[in-house]
């Protein structure tokens, strides 16, 4: 903490000008005004303090708003953002879209700090709901985003917000999380044509159950062996050779490459060779022609 | 609270299936965030874990039991159930259902009391 | 699989004494998300298995702070400050990044 000293005469900061770069510390801690520094945080931005006037320019705000700054401050801190802690932004009201975008943008090219982290977990929890805007805004900024939710915050995601997410935004989640935006996704799109219908679900499909798979088969969505090898390889399994058939349609092909990988090579284990054999593709490891499968209660649910 | 309570026959023949059924009651099982596990205690040793599934029907299963296994959810009567065939001597085991999810993967917070299967002729 | 391997098998204890048990991984925990999601479990005689502790330090309500967990990557412990009566049981940790989620093989505490 700076020594309380007195202001040398005529140094009294009357504003936030790039006078205030000659300032030791001290003198800054003397001769600024935290009130004054407050209304013009704005130009605080434009001029090259150090680290360690930064500091002080800090410790003044803490001292003015010991209860947390408000969001006319907030809004303009710039890269003071950076000298805040995690306990700091926990004290912040954040309501604005436009003070949200403001902060990130400071940290933006960089992985998400502990700071951002509980900034954005303060703003979210203050709307109640991470709306379309807000998810926007954030996978703008961390296309990871998404996928560094906890299952219940995602559960909290309103099916209107899933029209604002790229398939790029999905591309670290684990299967538990898009077992919880899938649903999500179906009901935001049910109201589309076949066709557009599978384009905007294709990247939520990792957590799509056997049901809806055998449903997709039916509608002649043609889907391509990438989006197929992302599937549920327990959704896969039950799927007749037909089903895969009519799923992939002329990427049926595509199989072959695929034959040593997972979903593939425990799909074609699971099915009849001579089911295999009519695809024409020259899959082999199916079930030998000719075998009886013993446990019938087993097919039966399967198919 | 939620709570959860497995039911489903002791004793199962060798080769057969083996069904159990996990009750929710105090909560959804539609809510949100949440995944539905089974996992096993063969007797005297330690815990394996089975398979989990949402309540959309997504599931995931060990590897050791794919194929054998298949998890099933019924959201109005707000229960999840597991069935096991070609069963043997080696799925003599308590089987516990239990609630995962929420605030993180992991969080195991909520168990059924267990049903003790027997697989013998 | 990823493989989780506890020590000691047993760990005999006297009432008030503290009691660590530890648990390493075949390999390392951390999640795509940053996050470790290493469990704790308790299991006291004839009863299913309870949760104590979640990504490797938070403690679920309800549970004694006399019970915490510490670790990182694939080292893990789970420390009891002082032993109590009903602190006897089974503990196991559980790894729930990678499927399947796997349990270590358990460490039995029991009183001296």
């Known amino acids: 903490e700076v020594e309380k000293t007195a202001c040398p005469s005529g140094k009294k900061a009357r504003e936030i000008d790039e006078s205030l770069i000659f300032y030791k510390k001290w003198e800054l801690e003397a001769c600024v005004d935290a009130a004054l520094l407050a209304t013009q945080m704005d130009r605080v931005n434009a001029i090259p303090f150090t680290y360690e006037q930064l500091d002080v320019l800090k410790h003044k705000l803490d001292e003015l708003y010991p209860q947390g700054y408000p969001e006319s401050v907030i809004q303009h801190l710039g890269y003071l953002f950076l000298k805040m802690s995690p306990e700091d932004i926990r004290k912040w009201n954040v309501t604005s879209l436009e003070t949200l975008k403001a902060l990130l943008e400071v940290n933006k090219g960089h992985e998400m700090s502990p700071q951002v982290a509980t900034l954005i977990d303060r703003f979210v929890k203050g709307r109640g709901q991470l709306d379309k805007d807000t998810l926007d805004t954030l996978t703008a900024f961390y296309p990871g985003y998404l996928c560094s939710l906890s299952p219940e915050e995602l559960s909290s995601v309103p099916p209107s917000s899933i029209w604002a997410v790229r398939p790029q935004d999905l591309d670290t989640c684990d299967p538990r999380q898009l077992d919880v935006l899938y649903p999500k996704a179906r009901l935001a799109f049910q109201n589309m044509n076949g066709s557009e219908y599978f384009v905007k679900i294709q990247s939520f499909l990792g957590g799509a159950p056997t049901e809806d798979l055998k449903a997709l088969s039916q509608q002649n969505v043609s889907m391509d062996l990438a989006t197929f090898m992302k599937l549920r390889t327990d959704a896969v399994l039950p799927l007749t050779v037909a089903e895969v058939q009519k799923l992939l349609g002329p990427h049926v092909e595509g199989l072959k490459a695929e034959e040593r990988h997972r979903p593939v090579r425990d799909w074609i284990l699971r099915q009849r060779q001579d089911d295999l054999d009519t695809l024409g593709l020259g899959l082999q490891g199916g079930i030998p022609n000719g075998y009886l499968v013993l446990d019938l209660s087993m097919q039966e649910a399967l198919s | 609270q939620v709570q959860l309570q497995e039911s489903g026959p002791g004793l199962v023949k060798p080769s057969q299936t083996l069904s159990l059924t996990c009750t929710v009651s105090g909560g959804s099982i539609s809510s949100g965030g949440y995944y539905w596990n089974w996992i096993r205690q063969h007797p005297g040793k330690g815990l394996e874990w089975i398979g989990y599934?949402?309540?959309?029907?997504?599931?995931y299963y060990n590897p050791s039991l794919r194929g054998r296994l298949i998890i099933s959810v019924d959201t109005s009567k707000n229960q999840f159930s597991l069935r096991l065939s070609s069963v043997t001597a080696a799925d003599t085991a308590v089987y516990y259902c239990a609630r995962d999810g929420g605030d993180s993967y992991g969080r195991m917070d909520v168990w059924g009391q267990g049903t003790t299967v027997t697989v013998s002729a | 699989d990823i493989v989780m391997t506890q020590t000691p098998l047993s760990s005999p204890v006297t009432l008030g004494q503290p009691a660590s048990i530890s648990c390493r991984s075949s390999?390392?925990?951390?999640?795509?998300?940053?996050?470790?999601?290493l469990s704790w479990l308790q299991q006291r005689p004839g009863q299913p298995p309870r949760l104590l502790i979640y990504k490797i330090s938070n403690r679920f309500s309800g549970v004694p702070d006399r019970f915490s967990g510490s670790g990182a990557g694939t080292d893990f412990t789970l420390k009891i400050s002082r032993v109590e009566a009903e602190d006897v049981g089974v503990y196991y940790c559980m790894q729930a990044t990678q499927f399947p989620l796997t349990f270590g093989g358990g460490t039995k505490v029991e009183i001296k």
């Open positions: 390999q390392s925990l951390v999640h795509s998300d940053r996050n470790t999601y």
């Open positions: 599934i949402y309540y959309s029907g997504s599931t």
